[in-house]
Every structure is written in structure tokens, then in C-alpha cells.
């Protein structure tokens, strides 16, 4: 029979997206039990039919990838997860409404950070995404956000920080000491989706001056 | 080195269509964003449309949307906006831009479009 | 939308004197400014990016400042090929606005 309440055997459905890699997750209810079986299904937004997503049928692990099931930008989607358990007690629970767009989040930038002799130099490698596009080639997220930017910040000292920012990949702070540690740290930025990603930190040190040997 | 070139302006009665082009070469067109920017007579300089070439993720401005479309055939490295539903107050120049090593740097030398009975 | 309040509308000035631009954002844009100028009949040049990024080949008496909400654009010693329309442009968020233009002439 179904337990009065599905959050025995099902809890937390949801979707977590991190640079467009959509994954279901969830967990087992207070009645859940290590031979509690899970089944997914998906559907776009507005559809009648859930779809079985193969590979996630009558699964034990708690997530689902359904990254290529959820890769169209412009379409939302649901998710559902079936949890039956060893007692043949059954539950299901559906995620919110998932707009990869609105809910993914972002990772740290790829950087190099490159040490000179006054300056450094910070070059951002473009962040590729799962999402194809139709010459197969794979979406970078300055293919899907008009918007996003790069904000850098080197910590000179305690009190002073320089910064810079763009649509550039390649920038340089310049006027510094020889001989010297900084810290940079370098952030990716969509603010019309109200986006931030965790920092991409690099700690270089400036090349002693030679040329008063 | 980088070009655009404008065609397909010209006059047109007020709910009228146009379809503009922009020929590009000399960078890798199929990826990049890529612009239209109008300037009306004697008046400043407006962002119609935006389109990523790789993507095909479009944006436009309030004032356009509905009535205009911006594509791309990036076989043959062009841009399109098709203008429907034309008014007077779409009269303008049409540039097409391209964003390259994050700045909006390019230019074509626009195309005269004329919305008038 | 980010609205781009641009001042003076018109300047007039003498060959040689410094001329001083100011560009308004209705918001925090940080440092998402371009600077363009334009001849009649011409596309806009690029001046300035990232607010005061002089643009390659771009001659070292144009210069930029600011950040946040407010910028301003400075040509010192103004030459005759500087007699134009300057725009700020914002690259924050679209759509991207332009203030609405100083034309620079000849006093």
C-alpha cells in the first residue's frame, strides 16, 4: 500500500545544474531503506507524457544526469522520481518547474595566471558547457549569456585591491613591484541572470628585476 | 582583416517588409555575436538586435520585438534581419557590428532604410 | 533598461584646449563603458573600453575614467580630426544603450 505521506520513503527532489550539467537528486525518507528502488521520468513544460529516462529505471543511487533530456535553453522541464520499496510501498514526488537558464549555477573560471617582471597577466579560457550546438560543436557560456563578464581583483596588500573587468579574455594589471606575491582571484558575472560564480584564485609572484644585476 | 557589408535597404510604405544583409569576413563568423544598430536622421545611435552565430541565441529591443528577426546562414557568413510591419519611426541607417576579443570594435558603413508613404 | 544620461549636448572648443565629456548611468555598470566617435556619415570608432582602456592605435589624448554610475571622457588638446559626436555606450546588460551624444565644434 502507499504510506499516508510520501516523504517517508521520498524527500528533496530536485534538480542541481552547474554549468548546464543538469542532475537529478534526492533522498531516501525516514523509511527509505538501502533496497528502496528509484525510477525517473521527465517531460517538457506543457507536454501530457512523461518519458522513462533509460539507465534510471528501478535504480538504488540517489541522482539521474539528465543533462542531454533538459539541454534545450529556451524549453523548461519536470522530473519525477517513482521510489518503490522492498515492501512493494510506493511513492512519488516531482521536481519544481527547471529552467536550466534561471537555476544553473556557475563554476570557477579556467585561468592562467602569468607572472612578469612589473606586471601579470590573466588569461580566462572560455568555460565549455554539455549543450551542442548544430555543427556539434559544444556551447562555451559566452555563447548562451550576452551579458557575462569577467571581474578580476589583485590583492596588492592588506588595504589595496586593483581590479578590472570586460568581455576580454586576456588582461594585465601592470605597475607592480618586481620580487612581489599577489593574489588574484578572477569571477565569471551574468548580472541579467543575477549570476556570480565562486572565484578561480591564483597566487603569483612577480619576477625579480634583472636588469640592476 | 575584418569586413561587413550592408545590403538590402531601401524605401518602404509604412507596414511594409525589408529583409537587410551583412556579408562578413576576415573572423571566424560562426562564432561570435553579432549586431544591429540603427541611427535615425540627425538622432543618436539605438541597439536593435543581438545573435550569437553559434548558439542562435537572440535579443532585441523592446521597441522591435515581434516585428523584427535577426538570423544567421553561417555557411555563407551572413546576417540577416528580416523588418516587418514597418513604421516611420524605423527609418534610420542600419549597421551591423561584430563583438571580437570581447569588444564591439567592427563596423560596416550601414545601409539606408526609409519607411514612407 | 540602463538609461545613459550624456552632458553637454554640444561643446564648442579651440584647437589645443582640453575638452571634458561626462556620461551617467541610471545604474552601477561598473566598468562596462565604451567610448566611440563619429563623423557624419561614418560608423563609430572605437576610443575607449573597460572605461579608460585606451583602444590600440587610438592616440594618447583621449583618455577615460570613472566607474560604477559615472564616466567621463577627456580629449587634451583637441586636434581638428576631433571635431565629432562622442558616444558612451554601456556593455553591461542588454540592451545596450547609448547616451545620446556630445558633438564637439569648433569655437
Known amino acids: 500500500h502507499a504510506p499516508e505521506d510520501p516523504s517517508d520513503l521520498l524527500q528533496h527532489v530536485k534538480f542541481q545544474s552547474s554549468n548546464f550539467e543538469n542532475i537529478l537528486t534526492w533522498d531516501s525518507g525516514p523509511e527509505g531503506t538501502p533496497d528502496t528502488v528509484y525510477s525517473i521520468e521527465y517531460k517538457t513544460y506543457g507536454e501530457r507524457d512523461w518519458v522513462a529516462k533509460k539507465g534510471c529505471q528501478r535504480i538504488t543511487r540517489k541522482s539521474c544526469n539528465l543533462t542531454v533530456e533538459t539541454g534545450n535553453l529556451t524549453e523548461l522541464y519536470y522530473a519525477r522520481v517513482t521510489a518503490v520499496s522492498a515492501g512493494g510501498r510506493s511513492a512519488t514526488k516531482m521536481t519544481d518547474r527547471f529552467s536550466s537558464l534561471q537555476h544553473t549555477t556557475l563554476k570557477p573560471p579556467d585561468v592562467t595566471c602569468i607572472s612578469k617582471v612589473r606586471s601579470i597577466q590573466m588569461i580566462v579560457h572560455p568555460t565549455p558547457t554539455p549543450i551542442r550546438a548544430g555543427d556539434g560543436h559544444r556551447l562555451t557560456l559566452e555563447d548562451i549569456f550576452h551579458d557575462l563578464f569577467y571581474h578580476l581583483e589583485l590583492q596588492v596588500n592588506r588595504t589595496y585591491q586593483m581590479h578590472l573587468g570586460g568581455k576580454q579574455r586576456e588582461y594585465e594589471f601592470f605597475g607592480l613591484t618586481p620580487d612581489t606575491e599577489f593574489l588574484g582571484t578572477i569571477m565569471i558575472c551574468v548580472p541579467t541572470w543575477a549570476k556570480e560564480s565562486a572565484p578561480y584564485m591564483c597566487r603569483v609572484k612577480t619576477l625579480p628585476d634583472r636588469t640592476w644585476t | 582583416e575584418v569586413q561587413l557589408v550592408e545590403s538590402g535597404g531601401g524605401l518602404v510604405q509604412p507596414g511594409g517588409s525589408l529583409r537587410l544583409s551583412c556579408a562578413a569576413s576576415?573572423?571566424?563568423?560562426?562564432?561570435?555575436?553579432m549586431y544591429w544598430v540603427r541611427q535615425a536622421p540627425g538622432k543618436g545611435l539605438e541597439f536593435v538586435s543581438v545573435?550569437?552565430?553559434?548558439?542562435?541565441?537572440?535579443h532585441y529591443v523592446e521597441s522591435v520585438k515581434g516585428r523584427f528577426t535577426i538570423s544567421t546562414d553561417n555557411a555563407k557568413n551572413t546576417l540577416f534581419l528580416q523588418m516587418n510591419s514597418l513604421k516611420s519611426e524605423d527609418t534610420a541607417v542600419y549597421y551591423c557590428?561584430?563583438?571580437?576579443?570581447?569588444?564591439?570594435?567592427?563596423w560596416g558603413q550601414g545601409t539606408q532604410v526609409t519607411v514612407s508613404s | 533598461d540602463i538609461q545613459m544620461t550624456q552632458s553637454p549636448s554640444s561643446m564648442s572648443a579651440s584647437l589645443g584646449d582640453s575638452v571634458t565629456i561626462s556620461c551617467q548611468a541610471s545604474?552601477?555598470?561598473?566598468?562596462?563603458l565604451f567610448w566611440y566617435q563619429q563623423n557624419a556619415g561614418q560608423p563609430p570608432k572605437l576610443l575607449i573600453y573597460g572605461a579608460s582602456r585606451l583602444q590600440t592605435g587610438v592616440p594618447s589624448r583621449f583618455s577615460g575614467s570613472g566607474s560604477g554610475t559615472t564616466f567621463t571622457l577627456t580629449i587634451s588638446g583637441v586636434e581638428t580630426g576631433d571635431l565629432a559626436t562622442y558616444y558612451c555606450l554601456q556593455d553591461y546588460s542588454w540592451p545596450l544603450t547609448f547616451g545620446q551624444g556630445t558633438k564637439v565644434e569648433l569655437k
Open positions: 545573435i550569437n552565430t553559434r548558439s542562435g541565441i537572440t
Open positions: 576576415g573572423f571566424t563568423f560562426s562564432s561570435s555575436w
Open positions: 545604474e552601477n555598470i561598473g566598468t562596462q
Open positions: 557590428a561584430t563583438r571580437i576579443q570581447g569588444l564591439i570594435d567592427y
